[in-house]
């Protein structure tokens, strides 16, 4: 930028230094040089001399015209060619910007992640504006009528300490930039209805060596919420389609879920929970990969036409023994957790 340029004249922009992308723009340069009657006035955009659509209005002033200016940012400056001077003389410069007014923010969502101490609100900003755009989040108590406002760029975290006076709120977002202002639809929020339970984690899995082997998945959460509804999705790593099973969970103890799965296959498991009867889900947990045991030679495996699952509190010890005549067949492969950062949202897919 050129905030501290010393001008020997003036430069101005019509319709203004920030304007709607695609508009026709006129930029004027007026010299006020001492001891110079300029032969020519020149315009530069981002350091490159412009050749076309320049009009000399009078002895001191020239204009350059751009049809449908569509660059988000440009640095313009103008110079004078003074008789007897080897170099051009700087007159003035300006940063110009083009962009769009904001769209109305959409899909406003507010949640409280358990133990976070914050209400987190997110929204879709719409199409890019290309210029500085701020979002004002309005939080109005439906009980006291008091309104709080928070400035944000893309989301906001509001301390629940500042939401002590009430449980019911009206929330909306105002998008503001130099070219316009739009409001989102209003969201009715009850603080007790937007809590997302503390993250659910699959801690381990094991496959038994029963006549019909079963896989037990162990999962837990530090939530203090009593009634929690969960989904566990699972698939082989080669499959595109998830199977989903539903559970009512009580996290005062580690959850155990039994699955009857195909042998000698690598499975991916993920879990997510919500407070029973509420709307907001946790994001899916990190993918947990487990390899089921190979078949024994004695058993003719008949895969279930539809794998079924149920929960049990029965304890099953992890298989470590190996058959003496087929040592490699019963060996357990240890489960591993991918510790990457899966995509956010509830539609995270694993290859």
């Amino acid at each position: 930028g050129i905030t501290s340029i010393n001008c020997s004249g003036d430069m101005w922009v019509e319709p203004g230094e920030i304007f709607q992308m695609g508009m026709n723009v006129s930029i004027y340069c007026q010299e006020a040089l001492k001891h110079c009657r300029p032969r020519n006035l020149y315009f530069y955009k981002n350091g490159f001399k412009e050749e076309f659509d320049i009009t000399r209005i009078n002895r001191t002033t020239a204009r350059i015209w751009y049809k449908g200016f569509s660059e988000p940012h440009a640095y313009m400056h103008c110079t004078a060619e003074c008789p007897g001077h080897f170099q051009e003389t700087l007159i003035c410069g300006k940063d110009i910007s083009s962009g769009h007014p904001p769209d109305a923010p959409s899909n406003l969502t507010c949640v409280i992640y358990e133990y976070s101490g914050n209400m987190t609100c997110t929204w879709n900003t719409g199409k890019p504006t290309y210029i500085d755009t701020k979002y004002i989040v309005h939080v109005k108590s439906l009980e006291t009528e008091e309104e709080q406002q928070y400035l944000a760029s893309s989301y906001v975290k509001i301390s629940t300490d500042s939401l002590q006076g009430s449980r019911k709120y009206l929330v909306w977002v105002q998008a503001v930039n130099s070219l316009g202002m739009e409001n989102s639809q209003q969201l009715h929020v009850h603080l007790d209805d937007i809590v997302i339970p503390s993250a659910s984690i699959i801690s381990r899995a094991e496959t038994t060596n029963d006549t019909v082997p079963k896989t037990i998945v162990y999962w837990k959460s530090k939530t203090m919420i009593e009634k929690v509804f969960c989904e566990m999705r699972y698939k082989t790593t080669t499959n595109q389609t998830w199977s989903v099973k539903e559970f009512d969970a009580n996290f005062t103890y580690v959850q155990q879920s039994e699955f009857y799965l195909e042998p000698d296959s690598k499975y991916v498991f993920q879990v997510r929970c919500q407070e029973t009867g509420k709307r907001n889900w946790q994001p899916w947990s990190s993918p947990f990969v487990h390899q089921t045991s190979q078949e024994t030679g004695k058993r003719n495996w008949q895969p279930w036409s539809s794998p079924f699952v149920h929960q049990t509190s029965q304890t099953v010890s992890q298989v470590t023994a190996k058959s003496s005549h087929e040592p490699q067949k019963m060996e357990m492969l240890s489960a591993t957790i991918f510790r990457g950062h899966p995509a956010s949202g509830n539609h995270q897919d694993i290859g």
């Epitope: 004002i136 309104e147 709080q148 406002q149 928070y150 400035l151 944000a152 500042s162 105002q174 503001v176």
Partner: nanobody, 116 residues
Framework: QVQLQESGGGLVQPGGSLRLSCAAS????????MRWVRQAPGKGLEWVSG???????IYADSVKGRFTISRDNAKNTLYLQLNSLKTEDTAMYYC??????????GSQGTQVTVSS
């Protein structure tokens, strides 16, 4: 009831600086977003700048890079630092609740005059 008292205005030459203050009472200042608006002679009210309770700020294009809004929650006071003043900054300056908008709630204001 809500009370806002502006001060710090005066006569200053172009290029000069001033610091405006707004003393607040009658509401929970630390939880309340605030703004400055101004009214030039013969013109309508113009929003200048806003700040939320956490200190995030927003400015009108006409003052960006020259004015700085800030707050001291311990003193229940809002500030506006005016630098590189221009003649077109001459106006009555008012503080108000809320981060954005070209209205104010009837406080007395403080006069800023920029003239050589």
């Amino acid at each position: 009831q809500v009370q806002l008292q502006e001060s710090g205005g005066g006569l200053v030459q172009p290029g000069g600086s001033l610091r405006l203050s707004c003393a607040a009472s009658g509401f929970t200042f630390r939880l309340t977003a605030m703004r400055w608006v101004r009214q030039a002679p013969g013109k309508g009210l113009e929003w200048v700048s806003g700040i939320d309770s956490r200190g995030s700020t927003i400015y009108a294009d006409s003052v960006k890079g020259r004015f700085t809004i800030s707050r001291d929650n311990a003193k229940n006071t809002l500030y506006l630092q005016l630098n590189s003043l221009k003649t077109e900054d001459t106006a009555m300056y008012y503080c108000a609740q809320g981060v954005y908008g070209d209205t104010y709630s009837g406080s007395q204001g403080t006069q800023v005059t920029v003239s050589s």
